[in-house]
């Protein structure tokens, strides 16, 4: 089994690891499928691509019968199988079988924290946000290891790219020193950003 790892939105080339000459194409059937669902077929030189792959998939016959998937999505992850059948003695017989496992990485960038003064009060508001990752994120605010209550946390998913965006607001009393951590967990991974507030100098700075 061949393993291919790519970033989301990139191009993945999955090789069947087999070549068929132009002359042999008329007697050859080629199938690409993902977990038993059809991706594309080529029968006697005529190709057919299944609807969910039509707008993103290309068949490169000259390069080991590879399929090229453009604009990778998280749902493209999985095991692809290439089957080559050749017509011999009144029947199609299997000439080649290959499996390719595709992993699609979609890491959230380090979140950014911006802050706003709320007029006529000692309250300051900070907003932590990041986007472009997968799977669904869970955001939490921490101070001294203790979880804080956010005002509101929104998680949205782009239906086209399948990627998530997350944003959360936190209000704090600006008369005391603070060190807040915005922690985002997704799958087995995590990213974080720290926001420090110093009352003596009335300044703040994120840790990078």
């Amino acid at each position: 089994v061949i393993h291919v790892t790519k970033e989301v939105k990139e191009v993945a080339t999955l090789s069947c690891g087999h070549n068929v000459s132009v002359e042999e194409l008329a007697q050859t059937r080629i199938y690409w499928q993902k977990e038993k669902k059809m991706v594309l077929t080529m029968m006697s030189g005529d190709m057919n691509i299944w609807p969910e792959y039509k707008n993103r998939t290309i068949f490169d016959i000259t390069n080991n019968l590879s399929i090229v998937i453009l604009a990778l999505r998280p749902s493209d992850e999985g095991t692809y199988e290439c089957v080559v059948l050749k017509y011999e003695k009144d029947a199609f017989k299997r000439e080649h079988l290959a499996e390719v496992t595709l992993s699609v990485k979609a890491d959230f960038p380090t979140p950014s924290i911006s802050d706003f003064e709320i007029p006529t009060s000692n309250i300051r508001r900070i907003i932590c946000s990041t986007s472009g990752g997968f799977p669904e994120p869970h955001l939490s605010w921490l101070e001294n290891g203790e979880e804080l209550n956010a005002i509101n946390t929104t998680v949205s998913q782009d239906p086209e790219t399948e990627l998530y965006a997350v944003s959360s607001k936190l209000d704090f009393n600006m008369t005391t020193n603070h060190s807040f951590m915005c922690l985002i967990k997704y799958g087995h991974l995590r990213v974080n950003q720290t926001f420090n507030w110093n009352t003596t100098k009335q300044e703040h700075f994120p840790d990078n």
């Epitope: 194409l25 030189g45 998939t57």
Partner: nanobody
Framework: EVQLVESGGGLVQAGGSLRLSCAAS????????MGWFRQAPGKERDFVAA????????YYADHVKGRFTISRDNAKNTVYLQMNSLKPEDTAVYYC??????????????WGQGTQVTVSS
Amino acid sequence: EVQLVESGGGLVQAGGSLRLSCAASGRTFSSKAMGWFRQAPGKERDFVAAITWSGGSTYYADHVKGRFTISRDNAKNTVYLQMNSLKPEDTAVYYCATNPYGLGQVGYDYWGQGTQVTVSS
């Protein structure tokens, strides 16, 4: 740079035939396939058919299967689109394009200027 020049368009009655040509010049060796697309007034550009440089493999959009045939002449560096049983809904500007990846509906890089096909009822 690749240059593509389409020809063969015109006015034809429903049920009639036309043969479009696309002459390619320049760095065509960097492409693995060529395709035909069409764009009707006020609509998006739609895939019609594609063929590998060797001519051994073809790919058609469902709405033209059985009516249109794509072929190529390597000696002339030209790709053809034979259009039979034409319908008024086939009226569009037809473009040819090159694909550096292979056979498919996407990934095309160089485009011709287009040739108008009008099918009257």
